[in-house]
Amino acid sequence: GIAIPRNSGCPNSEDKNFPRTVMVNLNIHNRNTSTNPKRSSDYYNRSTSPWNLHRNEDPERYPSVIWEAKCRHLGCVKADGNVDYHMNSVPIQQEILVLRREPRHCPNSFRLEKILVSVGCTCVTPIVHHVA
Amino acid sequence: GIAIPRNSGCPNSEDKNFPRTVMVNLNIHNRNTSTNPKRSSDYYNRSTSPWNLHRNEDPERYPSVIWEAKCRHLGCVKADGNVDYHMNSVPIQQEILVLRREPRHCPNSFRLEKILVSVGCTCVTPIVHHVA
């Protein structure tokens, strides 16, 4: 857990909710070098394991909108454009942090939440289970 | 910007820093159904665009450890195990939220930060630029 601070110059934490509750400055600092990176660009179309992006919207969460990748095929796309079912398109998932409004309707009170999102797809060799 | 709330039952926001500052409960709620999902499992090894995971650690950030994917090859791995340089292994990137301690070393004061992380790799057809 997060320990109780005694640092001078830090915001007061003598709150009954501390150490569970912290102050967060919402002036987001963006560490991305490009101001608007085309992150995964058009990879979703050019990949051998292409995917579609589906919008997941929830106004009680920040970010309110998250895009979920759904692989287009069970198999992977070959150079001739056909699908090779000897290979598998699988989603690459990542656990991300979001802020959930809590109590609901309170615009300045949140709870940290972890959610699992599919970011894109990759083509893998299947695991073959041999029957004895 | 974010406006000053007057909702009863909501945390007080008559702070000189408000509306930039909100309260966040750090008792993380985990929405993932599985308690410990093997997120992208062993896909990093089985993928035709395999990757290695590099640890990015920063004690002034939450989460303090983030795993960054680095594609192993410029090309993609063929069925015979050789690398096909007519295809490209590329990182799938995602913008994620982290909490940055601010002022530094203050355990209960954070700033929201967006960082771009590589989650895994996918195999794409290269964009060929034809010279006239």
Epitope: T35, K38, S40, E57, P59, Y62, W67, H105, P107 | G1
Partner: antibody, heavy 122, light 110 residues
């Protein structure tokens, strides 16, 4: 100063086309915002037209009546959002406002331009 | 689409009066409702969001309440600068997002 400035309005004949522009300054188009168009006919109320995500995913929403005739687009390098209007009718005469939705709270419009007047008349 | 019915459509009052404007949604919108003030020749100005949260810089004489389908904007003591047209606005998401506005309430001097 954070502001939105619309341009491109004017007189157009019925069945004609027009492209409106909205230049943003004081902030950059990014994953933090959605850019929208809202219109107001003379002496009438406000009517939402469409919104577009300002981040790196191409995503749009349209009012049911606007889909097909109106197209929202953006150019992040120019920090500008556009509204292409086709097959214009007299009832499309209105002040067209550019408005921003902050991704922190997508339930309302937090910034508005001054508007540009479009008149559809023969 | 969700219909937003605002009433009254026009209202006359005097400085110092307490004024109430209502907005009714055709289906539940939780508390995702905003109120705007608009003066002639100007764009709308945000007053209230999330049904009851006062926007930055807005005087405390303005307040909002309600949830579900019924919402109210109250001006506790009218000031000369408050004579304007007021609009409610909803947010809704099902398969796609939509915003809708009420027809407006024109507040004039009695």
């Amino acid at each position: 100063e954070v502001q939105l400035v619309e341009s491109g309005g004017g007189l157009v004949k019925p069945e004609g086309s027009l492209r409106l522009s909205c230049a943003a300054s004081g902030f950059s188009f990014s994953s933090d915002y959605w850019m929208c168009w809202v219109r107001q006919a003379p002496g009438k109320g406000l009517e939402w037209i469409a919104c577009i995500y300002a981040g790196d995913v191409d995503d749009t929403d349209y009012a049911s009546w606007a889909r097909g005739r109106f197209t929202i687009s953006r150019d992040n390098s120019k920090n500008t959002v556009y509204l292409q209007m086709n097959s214009l009718r007299a009832e499309d005469t209105a002040v067209y406002y550019c408005a921003r939705v902050d991704g922190f709270d997508i339930t309302y419009f937090d910034l508005w331009g001054q508007g540009t007047l479009v008149t559809v008349s023969s | 689409d969700i219909q937003m019915t605002q009433s009254p459509s026009s209202l006359s009052a005097s400085v110092g009066d307490r004024v109430t404007i209502t907005c009714q949604a055709s289906q539940t919108i939780n508390y995702w409702l905003a109120w705007y003030q608009q003066k002639p020749g100007k764009p709308p100005k945000l007053l209230i969001y999330r049904a009851s949260t006062l926007a930055s810089g807005v005087p405390s004489r303005f307040s909002g309440s309600g949830s579900g389908t019924d919402f109210t904007l109250t001006i506790s003591s009218l000031q000369p600068e408050d004579f304007a047209t007021y609009y409610c606005q909803n947010y809704y998401y099902s398969t796609s997002r939509s915003y809708g506005f009420g027809g407006g309430t024109k507040l004039t001097v009695l």
